[in-house]
């Protein structure tokens, strides 16, 4: 049975050209994560696995630093990176929790942080 | 360019431990990832196992419990030990490199892929 | 687990024609995905890595495409050594290699 909890950044907006920290934490479960995945839609920006450490997608590999922790650093934001973000907890015995973080990338100089909210 | 070259027994008996040594040239083993594959006659390929320059595992779940690999950066050396065999551990094993580079963050990262490879040996489990 | 579904298992194909071999997986893995060539007795040699990047001295009549599940990788102009058994390897989640598409003369 899966008792676990994802809790995300929720839904986040930054600056055009500025840089944006995506954070996951999953809880409520003694599963043990074997693999983070990091997806922008339906695109692969970063694998976190327990073991190996990280590998960052080619086409993302200029613009994305791992970490801090399992979250993932995006930089050199544009307009087009607005949109969904999810990641991916691979997890044993559990199988899998996803969460949802919605990034808006905005041209002005306000950029608000909205509220942070859970995914069952 | 990068050069990796298995060795070890080519006969094993059931129930004892199989033990590979592959050893690295042309480059330095204190960077990249390294990898253990096999494939059993007339078959495909399964990974067994990588291991990082600084010693982290990760092993194939179906063999977790049976296989450790270890580096010793002072021979530029990467060694495999498979427990308990049996006929089916019957392959041709293959060391290899995966490799890895340098994000923004200044950390190594994997690659995901194979792009060296030894030529391979063949280990027989049989009595 | 990810499964890796190779198609054909094998064919037959004559130099000079142009081969296509598809790779399925079980669930998406973006674009992490390699490609080998294996010839008897010989250790396999990486193709195309990231689903359509040719490996440094891969000739380019090799080229790969596709993301998601499905996946293809084409032979242009089939040459006298390009005979071999040619595998996928998906490196999404865990590390998982199709069964293997053996190509043979004509």
């Known amino acids: 049975m899966m008792t676990g909890t994802i809790e995300t950044t929720g839904n986040i907006s930054a600056e055009k050209g500025g840089s944006i920290i995506l954070q996951c934490h999953l809880s409520s479960t003694t599963a043990q994560v074997t693999q983070v995945n990091w997806e922008q839609q339906d695109q692969l920006l970063a694998i976190c696995n327990a073991d190996l450490g990280w590998h960052i997608s080619p086409s993302f590999k200029d613009r994305v630093a791992p970490g801090p922790g399992l979250g993932l650093t995006l930089q050199s934001l544009t307009v087009n990176d607005t949109g969904e973000y999810f990641c991916i907890y691979h997890t044993y015995p559990d199988g899998t929790y996803t969460g949802r973080i919605f990034l808006e990338v905005l041209e002005s100089s306000v950029a608000e942080h909205g509220a942070r909210f859970q995914i069952p | 360019e990068v050069q990796l070259q298995e060795s070890g027994p080519g006969l094993v008996k059931p129930s004892e431990t199989l033990s590979l040594t592959c050893t690295v040239s042309g480059g330095s083993i204190s960077s990249d990832y390294w990898g253990w594959i096999r494939q059993p006659p007339g078959k495909g390929l399964e990974w067994i196992g990588f291991?990082?320059?600084?010693?982290?595992?990760s092993y194939n779940p179906s063999l977790k419990s049976r296989v450790t690999i270890s580096v010793d950066t002072s021979k530029n050396q990467f060694s495999l030990k498979l427990s308990s065999v049996t006929a089916a551990d019957t392959a041709v094993y293959y060391c290899?490199?995966?490799?890895?580079?340098?994000?923004?963050?200044?950390?190594?990262?994997?690659?995901?892929?194979?792009?060296?490879w030894g030529q391979g040996t063949m280990v027989t489990v049989s009595s | 687990d990810i499964q890796m579904t190779q198609s054909p298992s094998s064919l037959s194909a004559s130099v000079g024609d142009r081969v296509t071999i598809t790779c399925k997986a079980s669930?998406?893995?973006?674009?992490?995905l390699a490609w080998y060539q294996q010839k008897p007795g010989k250790a396999p040699k990486l193709l195309i890595y990231y689903a359509n990047s040719l490996q440094t001295g891969v000739p380019s009549r090799f080229s790969g495409s596709g993301s998601g599940t499905d996946f293809t990788l084409t032979i242009s102009s089939l040459q006298p050594e390009d005979f071999a058994t040619y595998y996928c390897q998906q490196y999404y989640s865990g590390w998982t290699f199709g069964g293997g598409t053996k190509v043979e003369i004509k």
């Open positions: 669930q998406s893995i973006h674009k992490n």
């Open positions: 290899a490199r995966m490799p890895s580079f340098i994000t923004l963050a200044s950390l190594s990262t994997w690659e995901g892929y194979f792009d060296f």
């Open positions: 291991i990082t320059y600084s010693g982290s595992t």
